[in-house]
Amino acid sequence: KLTIESTPFNVAEGKEVLLLVHNLPQHLFGYSWYKGERVDGNRQIIGYVIGTQQATPGPAYSGREIIYPNASLLIQNIIQNDTGFYTLHVIKSDLVNEEATGQFRVYPELPKPSISSNNSKPVEDKDAVAFTCEPETQDATYLWWVNNQSLPVSPRLQLSNGNRTLTLFNVTRNDTASYKCETQNPVSARRSDSVILNVLYGPDAPTISPLNTSYRSGENLNLSCHAASNPPAQYSWFVNGTFQQSTQELFIPNITVNNSGSYTCQAHNSDTGLNRTTVTTITVYAEPPKPFITSNNSNPVEDEDAVALTCEPEIQNTTYLWWVNNQSLPVSPRLQLSNDNRTLTLLSVTRNDVGPYECGIQNELSVDHSDPVILNVLYGPDDPTISPSYTYYRPGVNLSLSCHAASNPPAQYSWLIDGNIQQHTQELFISNITEKNSGLYTCQANNSASGHSRTTVKTITVSAELPKPSISSNNSKPVEDKDAVAFTCEPEAQNTTYLWWVNGQSLPVSPRLQLSNGNRTLTLFNVTRNDARAYVCGIQNSVSANRSDPVTLDVLYGPDTPIISPPDSSYLSGANLNLSCHSASNPSPQYSWRINGIPQQHTQVLFIAKITPNNNGTYACFVSNLATGRNNSIVKSITVSASGTSPGLSA
């Protein structure tokens, strides 16, 4: 069947449309196009006789039509009047006629719309606003957008006039948004520029900042007022009901107690005609005195004296606070506060109690701090230390010994050699020493304030020959894979080289072996049972050398997984069962046996005479090393068969 398809069906003014012919019969004489739904010579657009290759325009021809050999008709530069039906009249070679009708609709390209408003400055909770989308256009659909979103569902929003008018009832400040309208028809869509709704509102109840209402005499009072309002509010300040100034901020420098009172901020909106006020009560306090600390003991002795610190002056109904080292007071049985917190007592002071200490007086506004106080705790002297630590010297060198003992006030020092007083200095110096200078060197430290004295004695040997060294150890029984051992070669001697041997060999290269302290210390990390060897240290200088006796490292290890022997697991009835358990361990482990989970005996060997099939089962050997705290075990299954049925064992 002959049909006409309009491409497109909805056409924009100024564009073109193709009336496309489908199922055109063969063997045609010609065809004609007509405007309308029927063949009417007065409304012929164009006619075409096949073979002439020339079309004949009709009365309805506008010059915008192009006819094609396949009978399709193109209409260019479409106008509104072109809307409607078009009929194709086909004449076949047998002069039989056929007709088909198509249609299209013409729509204008829409202009860019604009929004008109009936109220440019609506008042919140009072006015309504009607937006209208201009211009009014036939066959157009109207849409609205708020902040580029489609309209929210709201009983205050109403569309009317074919959606061309958007009414907002009882506007609120939240309706201050970007509004756009859009016009649509089948061929175009255009969106307006945005219109911002300017809702007048407020003022809301003003807020006064800052919120604090208590001030100290001498401070500056700076109050700021703000109220949500459109247009912005005009502000006025009243103090105790008396007008002060028309500003958003109120500033009063160097206030006194007389500035206490009620401060009112009034916000006014000239467009809405509304006023709102907020009142705050300001209290100005007199400045309190700066506190200070008194002490009942300015030079307390460590571990003997107590000290009472008192915060002055005494003021009724006042809170006293204390700080030590800029921290609040630590919890300690040696710190005691009086009932009113004004006195802090330190019981049995130590050198660590020096402070600084601060006290504070708290009033309504702030805390006033005292200046810091530092305690002068008398202590010591502690046991003096003599340096350097060398005990062996060669003849001809200088001996220079220094003594130090922690003490407050600093200690006074005296030196004695073999009990004879030498000098009252911190350092002892003897040049070009000889063997005669060997002896006991005593440093005595004395604290004149506490009256205490402490001494330290050091044996000095002056000899060309080095002494026989010895090895000291920090761990006599290290546990395998757990402990480290540090061997130190004694004594410490000046200008001496330290050497080490293991089992008569020089030290092997190993990441677990480390030399330190001028090679005087040998550390073995993560000891193993293989480290249980003979260790020897040696010392040498330019005139002599000496070696220590060997020290054998006793490494505790195990118990390893035990082994049960013999390995046999099948026995004949009547045979003797003699199982021996062994586990590598240092010290030797304790052994115990279980048969089928039942404890038996605490021996290394398990003996059962003349076994029977009743002796079938699991035999477990348990080993434990009390020194390493480790345990281990193994289980063996024993099968006893009746006489003569064993697969290969005989009694």
Epitope: T52, Q53, A55
Partner: antibody, heavy 118, light 106 residues
Framework: QIQLVQSGPELKKPGETVKISCKAS????????MNWVKQAPGKGLKWMGW????????TYPDDFKGRFAFSLETSATTAYLQINNLKNEDTATYFC???????????WGQGTTLTVSS | DIQMTQSPSSLSASLGGKVTITCKAS??????ISWYQHKPGKGPRLLIH???TLQSGIPSRFSGSGSGRDYSFSISNLEPEDIATYYC????????FGGGTKLEIK
């Protein structure tokens, strides 16, 4: 796209015959008539007539009856202009042009220059 | 045969200006007139048909009007690429070109 490609320039003597070709592509050759247009040096355009590519029937205006002949090779989608007994005044550029069904000359060849000189 | 008288045969105008060419037919041609632009070495280009209908892709600077025997063609806002010879063509009965108008830019 629709294209009309004409044969190259010709140099002839008076009394000779020339045959200019116009090869069409990009459309159904037998749906549209083919026109021929002359432009003598320094002169304007002159319509020489057209040939119905469906029936092969030519049409000539009075000025071009006699020595001028239009022909077709439909299988090759080619139209021809033949001028017999060439004269000096035949010196010109000759254009072929497709005519749509409303006889608008909407597509043109690039032109073929004919020079007739003794 | 129908005769077409085109005037002027040449004219000069300024860039951005406007020019008008006329064609007079020896008899009523029922608006069946088209206008062509012809540049040397190329085939002519169809600008307007049926008196005033712009061919697809032709800028709106070109326009045509007229009826009966008298027709005109205008180019506004002249551009350098408009330099060419312009012809009218009647197609009411057979076809006849006008004599042409050569357009130059001042």
């Amino acid at each position: 796209q629709i294209q009309l490609v004409q044969s190259g320039p010709e140099l002839k003597k008076p009394g000779e015959t020339v045959k200019i070709s116009c090869k069409a592509s990009g459309y159904t050759f037998t749906d549209y008539g083919m026109n021929w247009v002359k432009q003598a040096p320094g002169k304007g355009l002159k319509w020489m007539g057209w040939i119905n590519t469906y029936t092969g029937e030519p049409t000539y205006p009075d000025d071009f009856k006699g020595r001028f002949a239009f022909s077709l090779e439909t299988s090759a989608t080619t139209a021809y202009l033949q001028i017999n007994n060439l004269k000096n005044e035949d010196t010109a550029t000759y254009f072929c042009s497709r005519g749509d069904l409303l006889v608008r000359l909407d597509n043109w060849g690039q032109g073929t220059t004919l020079t007739v000189s003794s | 045969d129908i005769q077409m008288t085109q005037s002027p045969s040449s004219l000069s105008a300024s860039l951005g200006g406007k020019v008008t060419i006329t064609c007079k037919a020896s008899q009523d041609i029922n608006k069946y007139i088209s206008w062509y632009q012809h540049k040397p070495g190329k085939g002519p280009r169809l600008l307007i048909h049926y008196t005033s209908t712009l061919q697809s892709g032709i800028p709106s600077r070109f326009s045509g009007s007229g009826s009966g025997r008298d027709y005109s063609f205008s180019i506004s806002n002249l551009e350098p690429e408009d330099i060419a010879t312009y012809y009218c063509l009647q197609y009411d009965y057979l076809r006849t070109f006008g004599g042409g108008t050569k357009l130059e830019i001042k």
